[in-house]
């Protein structure tokens, strides 16, 4: 994920300004980039520290600029270093005097293990001195003065990794400042091979890309990108994703680009020469103009991009019919993602032609770890790579990069991940109240450890000694009642907080234990409540035979309906009744009872009763005579509650007859509210009276009611309870 590029602007130093710029393109280093002198390559070079400054035009770039007056101190070897995951990536380059006696053919030279190599220096100045060649500052070879050729060569018939290094050439009377340098890079493997044992075949790197012996990946020259370096960048751009731009008037002219080994240094595409200031000749393109265009059908050769194929054709020479390749694009990836710590499955989605494959999509963590997809699928338009991070933690927060590298080009999209700590209450919940089947809990959700905001809260509970799963209820308030608990059972309680987002359930907080009360005995059976007097009620029940040895008693609660007057009475368990006294006459009372041991019992249903009346009852109301026939009639009435009415008397006689000739019908069930008089004479007028009796006496009727029976053949009539004043 590290795209480190060192630009050596004018490696041949004259009296002009010269610089080194190190760019970490598309990458966000934790540790700063460093530029330094490469004493490994040249021990006896200048010791002055370098003035490294931030390149103001780029966020992640450092620069060393030498003014023309410092020219004498510049000769030597340099490096740029970037670190990722503790691993250093170092790029090396050199600067030498333009007035040196010899000049190298190239600044660097990359060969494969076993190659037949000639390292050559061109003689620029003729001197009557022996020529000497050094490797990494140590003498290796000399040529007598009269035999110094125009091209001074070091021949390595079978190059090995140990042959790699900085080779310098000068006359024997010269010094470091008149030396010419070139660096030989020997790939650890033979041509087209890579891997620890060099037994893997390299991808065919096009456009002079170089196969990395450790990864098998192509290191693409400046101006090309993609898995095989086949895709040309837009004009004057470079970098692994072609996002960097040469700002010069003539693009990348006079920029020597140095990339990580085994690439070495080269000009950008379209330029050649030690100073990269010469344009390619017609028919040539690419880095150092080393590539020849052999375009099919006379297609145009562009010195920067090679053959410009007609639509429908592709390949370096436009030799393949096929859909034009489209650089991949990363889509639907937000700039910022908030993630809860725990399992995380980021998704990277990309378009392009050909569609990216599983191997071509990676995710790079802030520490530089490269992740490969755990799952992969594609549609007609997109490839979707799903990555799995089993446990993402807050230190993983930072800039992650989705990277897609296909034959059609490479694209990287950085995005910020903010990993949140799941919330966890610091305190256990508090138990405010308990019964045999409920508990009132303060969940104590604050303070909590971790990140909010809290989306929801769960109260988890389970019996301690049961092998049951935790049950939970969603809670909104701090105070919550747990119902349907088991009596006399120890429970564990804890609170789980949930923050927004997937996997937002925090770890449950501290556990609180509590025990529910024992279940109470059932209420007494056969409860009966009757008035005893004007001030007493009598409550009776069946004898109680408890199942345990525990002492028990009967608790009776009575309260007045009319007044706020309540009393609880404890009755020994061996009794079967209690007299409730000191009551008010003509008042309704509600009574209930329970059997208590150490645990309170279950209340009975409510019973109601009135104390006996202290006044005469009122006259029955709503008296109606209906359904009159020739021999019968129905009388109905209502009575007022609360007067201890024990019976109703209906008194009737034929009108005009003597008082003593009346008939009394006594109805002893006061709940009956109608009665059918039978055995009446047809076509006869009767006088009917009705009155109520209680413990004090009878009510006084104010009216008598008239009832006239029908002739024998007629249908029943309703007189509507007409009244006649006596």
């Amino acid at each position: 994920a590290m795209d480190l590029i060192l630009i050596n602007s004018l490696p041949l130093v004259s009296d002009a300004e010269t610089s080194l710029t190190c760019i970490a393109s598309g990458w966000r280093p934790h540790e700063p980039i460093t530029i330094g002198r490469d004493f490994e390559a040249l021990m006896n070079q200048h010791q002055d520290p370098l003035e490294v400054t931030q390149d103001v035009t780029r966020e992640w770039a450092k620069k060393v600029v030498w003014k023309r007056e410092k020219a004498s101190k510049i000769n030597g070897a340099y490096f740029c270093e970037g670190r990722v995951r503790g691993e250093a990536i170092r790029i090396r380059t050199m600067k030498m005097r333009q007035q040196a006696s010899f000049l190298p053919a190239t600044l660097t030279m990359t060969v494969d293990k076993g190659d037949n190599v000639n390292i050559s220096f061109k003689k620029v100045l003729i001197k009557e001195e022996d020529a000497v060649i050094y490797k990494n500052g140590s003498f290796i070879h000399s040529v007598p003065r009269h035999e110094v050729p125009d091209i001074l060569e070091v021949h390595l018939p079978h190059a090995q990794p140990q042959d790699a290094g900085v080779y310098s050439a000068r006359y024997i009377g010269g010094n470091l400042f008149t030396s010419a340098f070139t660096r030989l890079i020997v790939r650890r493997c033979e041509a087209q091979k890579w891997g620890p044992e060099c037994n893997h075949l390299c991808t065919a790197c096009m456009n002079n890309g170089v196969c990395h012996e450790d990864t098998g990946e192509c290191i693409c020259p400046p101006g090309f990108m993609g898995r095989t370096c086949e895709k040309a960048c837009e004009l004057h751009t470079f970098g692994r994703t072609c996002k960097e731009r040469c700002s010069g008037q003539e693009g990348c002219k006079s920029y020597v680009f140095c990339l990580p080994d085994p690439y070495g240094c080269s000009c950008a595409t379209g330029w050649k020469g030690l100073q990269c200031n010469e344009a390619c000749h017609p028919g040539f393109y690419g880095p150092d103009c080393k590539l020849r265009c052999s375009c099919n059908n006379g297609e145009m050769c562009d010195r920067f991009q090679g053959c410009l194929c007609s639509p429908g054709w592709q390949g370096l020479q436009c030799e393949r019919e096929g859909i034009q390749r489209m650089t991949p694009k990363i889509v639907d990836l937000p700039d910022h993602i908030e993630v809860n710590s725990g399992k995380f499955n980021p998704i990277c989605k990309a378009s392009g032609w050909p569609l990216p494959t599983n191997e071509e999509m990676t995710l790079v963590k802030p520490d530089g770890t490269v992740l490969h997809p755990k799952d992969f699928n594609h549609t007609d338009h997109f490839s979707v790579a799903i990555f799995t991070i089993h446990r993402i933690l807050p230190p993983d927060s930072g800039v992650w990069v989705c990277s897609v590298n296909t034959v059609a080009g490479m694209v990287e999209k950085p995005f910020n991940i903010s990993v949140k700590v799941l919330p966890k209450p610091l305190n256990a919940p508090n138990v405010i109240d308990t019964g045999h089947n409920f508990a009132v809990i303060n969940i104590s959700s604050e303070p909590y450890f971790g990140d909010g905001p809290i989306k929801s809260k769960k109260l988890l509970y389970k019996p301690v000694n049961h092998y049951e799963a935790w049950q939970h209820i969603q809670v909104t308030n701090e105070i919550v009642t747990l119902n349907y608990l088991e009596p006399r059972t120890e429970y564990e309680l804890c609170v789980q907080l949930v923050r927004r987002g997937e996997g937002g359930e925090g770890h449950p907080g501290p556990v609180r234990r509590f025990t529910t009360a024992s279940i109470g005995l059932p209420p007494p059976r056969g409860l009966n409540l009757l008035p005893k007097s004007q001030t007493t009620l009598n409550l009776t029940w069946q004898p109680i035979f408890p199942s345990s040895e525990d002492d028990f008693y009967v608790e009776v609660e009575r309260r007045s309906v009319q007044k706020s007057d309540q009393q609880n009475i404890k009755v020994p368990g061996n009794l079967t009744s209690v007299l409730l006294n000191n009551l008010h006459p003509r008042e309704q009372y509600v009574v209930r009872a329970r059997v208590n041991t150490k645990a309170q019992g279950e209340w009975s249903e409510d019973l109601t009763a009135w104390t006996l009346s202290d006044i005469l009852p009122p006259q029955p109301e709503n008296i109606k005579i209906s359904n009159i026939t020739h021999s019968s009639a129905v009388i109905s009435w209502t009575i007022l509650d609360g007067y201890s009415i024990s019976s109703i008397t209906i008194r009737y006689k034929v009108q005009g007859k003597n008082e003593d000739q009346h008939v009394d019908v006594k109805i002893k069930n006061a709940t009956i509210t109608q009665y059918q008089l039978k055995g009446l004479e047809p076509e006869t007028a009767y006088q009917v009276d009705i009155f109520a009796e209680n413990n004090i006496g009878s009510s006084n009727p104010a009216f008598s009611h008239e009832l006239v029976t029908l002739p024998e053949s007629q249908a029943p009539a309703d007189l509507g309870g007409g009244k006649m004043l006596l």
Partner: antibody
Framework: SGPELKKPGETVKISCKAS????????IHWVKQAPGKGLKWMGW????????TYAEDFKGRFAFSLETSASTAYLQINNLKNEDTATYFC????????????WGQGTLVTVS | DIVMTQAALSVPVTPGESVSISCRSS???????????LYWFLQRPGQSPQLLIY???NLASGVPDRFSGSGSGTAFTLRISRVEAEDVGVYYC?????????FGGGTKLEIK
Amino acid sequence: SGPELKKPGETVKISCKASGYTFTDFSIHWVKQAPGKGLKWMGWINTETGETTYAEDFKGRFAFSLETSASTAYLQINNLKNEDTATYFCSRRYDYDTWFAYWGQGTLVTVS
Amino acid sequence: DIVMTQAALSVPVTPGESVSISCRSSSSLLHRNGNTYLYWFLQRPGQSPQLLIYRMSNLASGVPDRFSGSGSGTAFTLRISRVEAEDVGVYYCMQRLEYPFTFGGGTKLEIK
């Protein structure tokens, strides 16, 4: 191939047989022309690699295929709809840039 | 997608006269290699289309030199000098710069 009369929901497979040249040297393009309407490019198949490209409107129910030994390209349309009623042409280029130089006589597919 | 527009649905012409048929594209058809990827076809009644002009101005093999093509990046013209009876049919322009290739709606050449 000859005209086809099909019902909605059925599948049709029409053929385009090449002769007089090496079949794998030229890709085959398919073009649709609804009755009384203009031409619409459907896509193409690379006869050498079998790689296919479909225009957006022809992704899903349409499939190009090859029988190289018989120098024949095929267009298959699945789950036919009334709007698939059209003449379907196959075409190839003459050389590097003269595309659509040779055309088949067209196959009328009627969906009714 | 690039949209090709042929404004005239039909063009009446007297035999022996010259006629121009125009076509516009929604974006430039000029490729970075300097070529303009605009093609012209003639479809005679009941026949397959026939390539007339490729890359804006190049005459296809076997096409009489009475036909010529010209234009800029987005505006194109097919010119027929000395129209003959056999020139009747529908003329289509097509762009081959980008996928999907797209045709104009067609312009019918009618003899007065």
